[in-house]
């Protein structure tokens, strides 16, 4: 749809075009499967426009339908370790809080590869916090062209 001249002068956030692209900061301590993310111009090609980070987890600030995407490359990996030497390594993206809205949105397995990538459209609400859980013992790459996570507001 066409935007009025007044709308064109508004910041993107006010139009509802919330968007974020994050890079991996670190993995969690023992017994914490979550990946911790970071974003901002000083870090390179990551940014937050609307959504915010809460202790490394992405929190939504505007209701709407979002495109959620993620890619994770395992730095320490093996063509056989994902199935034979170690517990199966899986990546799950979900709403982890508030507890009343807790649900898995994406689940992927590193069967015999060292990179997974996926995306989906899903409704998200203000206050939803997205967690990315990497289970298994293999370590993810922190390289920004190999591991990244983001959301893009698509429509109300």
């Amino acid at each position: 749809q066409r935007l009025s001249r007044a709308q064109q002068q508004l910041p993107l956030e006010s139009l509802g075009w919330d968007i974020a692209e994050l890079q991996l900061n670190h993995t969690g301590p023992q017994q914490d499967p979550r990946l911790y993310w970071q974003g901002g111009p000083a870090l390179g090609r990551s940014f937050l426009r609307g959504p915010e980070l809460d202790k490394g987890q992405l929190r939504i600030r505007r209701d709407g339908i979002y495109m959620v995407h993620i890619q994770v490359t395992l730095a320490i990996c093996s063509s056989t370790s994902t199935s034979r030497h170690h517990h199966p390594t899986t990546l799950a993206v979900g709403i982890c809080s508030p507890a009343s809205r807790s649900i898995s949105l994406l689940r992927l397995s590193f069967h015999q590869g060292c990179t997974i990538a996926s995306q989906r459209l899903t409704p998200l609400a203000r206050g939803d916090t997205l967690c990315t859980n990497l289970t298994g013992t293999l370590l993810p790459s922190r390289n920004t062209d190999e591991t990244f996570f983001g959301v893009q507001w698509v429509r109300p």
């Epitope: 990996c77 060292c114 790459s141």
Partner: antibody, heavy 120, light 108 residues
Framework: EVQLLESGGGLVQPGGSLRLSCAAS????????MSWVRQAPGKCLEWVST????????FYAESVKGRFTISRDNSKNTLYLQMNRLRAEDTAVYYC?????????????WGQGTLVTVSS | EIVLTQSPGTLSLSPGERATLSCRAS???????LAWYQQKPGQAPRLLIY???SRATGIPDRFSGSGSGTDFTLTISRLEPEDFAVYYC?????????FGCGTKVEIK
């Protein structure tokens, strides 16, 4: 300046045990994966074991699996290698090495090594 | 396990000459995750190259790496006296991490 200082090597009889330590300084120890790599006299380098920054993930070469245990104490900035049921073929200089920050298993800093001799 | 074979075993050259060292993998190395190290007698290895072609911090530009898949090369464009040492390649794309057995670059 990054520094890695190994200790704990020595002469031990076959079947015996030894615990190696690696004291780290000059960097935020807890965010780096760490490894032990060994080199038998006049021989090739051999990767032994790796541990993630948190200590939650460990990896071992088949030749030491079930006999060696890697661990770390992030509060003391120290890496350990507990070696049990030692064999003559474990004789080597043992190096402590730091992984690249991105978690990749190339080693950007190495200690000077500690010699382990297994002999009767 | 990926086996790395380095050749030649020994390279006899004079200062100022060009050194070309080869590392061949028994199977393709994931995303060119290959490193080169230099080791002098009684010392720990020193990282020279990672990712097959990226120079580590502080490494002079006379050292360069190339290759992908199964064939990798370390080139020293003009040998300096301090470059005479043993050079090892290592793959880190697949568990277990493996090293080649080295190429000794000695003074002719």
């Amino acid at each position: 300046e990054v520094q890695l200082l190994e200790s704990g090597g020595g002469l031990v009889q076959p079947g015996g045990s030894l615990r190696l330590s690696c004291a780290a300084s000059g960097f935020t120890f807890s965010v780096y994966a760490m490894s032990w790599v060994r080199q038998a006299p006049g021989k090739c380098l051999e990767w032994v074991s790796t541990i993630s920054g948190s200590g939650g993930s460990t990896f071992y070469a088949e030749s030491v699996k079930g006999r060696f245990t890697i661990s770390r104490d992030n509060s003391k900035n120290t890496l350990y290698l507990q070696m049990n049921r030692l064999r003559a073929e474990d004789t080597a200089v043992y190096y402590c090495a730091r992984h690249d920050y991105s978690n990749y298993a190339y080693f950007d800093y190495w200690g000077q090594g500690t010699l382990v001799t297994v002999s009767s | 396990e990926i086996v790395l074979t380095q050749s030649p075993g020994t390279l006899s050259l004079s200062p100022g000459e060009r050194a070309t060292l080869s590392c061949r993998a028994s199977q393709s190395v994931r995303s060119s995750y290959l490193a080169w190290y230099q080791q002098k007698p009684g010392q720990a290895p020193r990282l020279l190259i990672y990712g097959a072609s990226s120079r580590a911090t502080g490494i002079p530009d006379r050292f360069s790496g190339s290759g992908s898949g199964t064939d990798f090369t370390l080139t020293i464009s003009r040998l300096e006296p301090e470059d005479f040492a043993v050079y090892y390649c290592q793959q880190y794309g697949d568990l277990p991490f493996t090293f080649g057995c080295g190429t000794k670059v000695e003074i002719k």
